[in-house]
């Protein structure tokens, strides 16, 4: 099994308020087994945005077909963006367990929010 890499290709994304933001994340291996989660921010104050293991997350949809057994694309779309959504988003692989434990993080994608065009 190759060593898992988490690829967040976009260092930054800029979206107008009210629009949807697409945050890209792909993994290079299904191993170790465990869910993908997305967070805004880092450290103890980080905010959970999406957890593959549970839901729903009303404003978040996965971009690819995550029910495919071989799926390695965990990009998400966040709808109706507001200035409060600005921040750095991390795609993180967890290793299964009780509880699941963080295994590896992507480098992060900074989301900035532009004023809604008048």
């Amino acid at each position: 099994e190759e060593e898992l890499q988490i690829i967040q290709p976009d260092k930054s994304v800029s979206v107008a308020a009210g629009e949807s933001a697409i945050l890209h994340c792909t993994i290079t291996s299904l191993f170790p087994v465990g869910p993908i989660q997305w967070f805004r921010g880092a450290g103890p104050a980080r905010v959970l945005i999406y957890n593959q293991r549970q839901g729903p997350f009303p404003r978040v949809t996965t971009v690819s077909e995550t029910t495919k057994r071989e799926n390695m694309d965990f990009s998400i779309s966040i709808s109706n963006i507001t200035p409060a959504d600005a921040g750095t988003y991390y795609c993180i692989k967890f290793r299964k367990g009780s509880p699941d434990t963080e295994f590896k993080s992507g480098a992060g994608t900074e989301l900035s929010v532009r004023a809604k065009p008048s």
């Epitope: 299904l30 191993f31 087994v33 869910p35 293991r53 077909e65 029910t67 495919k68 299964k96």
Partner: antibody, heavy 117, light 106 residues
Framework: DVQLVESGGGVVRPGESLRLSCAAS????????MSWVRQAPGKGLEWVAG???????YYSGSMKGRFTISRDNSKNTLYLQMNSLTAEDTAVYYC???????????WGLGTLVTVSS | ALTQPASVSANPGETVKITCSGG?????YGWHQQKSPGSAPVTVI????QRPPDIPSRFSGSASGSTTTLTITGVRAEDEAVYYC???????????FGAGTTLTVL
């Protein structure tokens, strides 16, 4: 409430074909992967095939080639086309909803397929 | 193949553990209850340790590597059934089941 109702079972002769259906309700069928699982008389559970929400298919090795899983998301219905049936295919066939990691959380009541000459 | 004992028995109120081995680190596990042959299975545990909302809290699951365990704390007469362990293997994209364990409540 999640409901899965299988139909299409019956008695067929060896070599014949049969198509099973599973009508789903109470959840977003088009967003969920689904599977067929069978149970021969006096035996345990055996996974037959699975299908992703968009139609990618996966089969147990022993079932590949003769069985075809499909779905119609507009009708909230899962199908299993079974060809060249043999006596060893006699079983109760269950449809099951898959979880995010391809285990099963809800099952139908099953439909009995009997292959006999 | 997943391996589980053919039968276990317990008195009402006791704690029952059913183990299932033969998986690997690439597996997730579930447990399914079948009260009579040919009746619809009921999932009591999925994703190693998750309980569906309608399943009593006396059912719990755990997993470590190649083994998963179903624990019934304070077993009741209505828990008498065949319990199947099931697994999904990420390395082969396939599901598998154990042969089933018959739980008898004395």
């Amino acid at each position: 409430d999640v409901q899965l109702v299988e139909s299409g079972g019956g008695v067929v002769r060896p070599g014949e074909s049969l198509r099973l259906s599973c009508a789903a309700s109470g959840f977003s069928f088009s967003s969920n992967a689904m599977s067929w699982v069978r149970q021969a008389p006096g035996k345990g559970l055996e996974w037959v095939a699975g299908i992703s929400a968009s139609g990618d298919t996966y089969y147990s090795g022993s079932m590949k080639g003769r069985f075809t899983i499909s779905r119609d998301n507009s009708k909230n219905t899962l199908y299993l086309q079974m060809n060249s049936l043999t006596a060893e295919d006699t079983a109760v066939y269950y449809c099951a909803r898959e979880t995010w990691n391809h285990l099963f959380d809800y099952w139908g009541l099953g439909t009995l397929v009997t292959v006999s000459s | 193949a997943l391996t589980q004992p053919a039968s276990v028995s317990a008195n009402p109120g006791e704690t029952v553990k059913i183990t299932c081995s033969g998986g690997s680190d690439s597996y997730y596990y579930g447990w399914h209850q079948q009260k009579s042959p040919g009746s619809a299975p009921v999932t009591v545990i999925y994703s190693d340790d998750q309980r569906p909302p309608d399943i009593p809290s006396r059912f719990s699951g755990s997993a470590s590597g190649s083994t998963t365990t179903l624990t019934i704390t304070g077993v009741r007469a209505e828990d008498e059934a065949v319990y199947y362990c099931g697994g999904y293997d990420y390395s082969t994209y396939t599901n598998t089941f154990g042969a089933g364990t018959t739980l008898t409540v004395l």
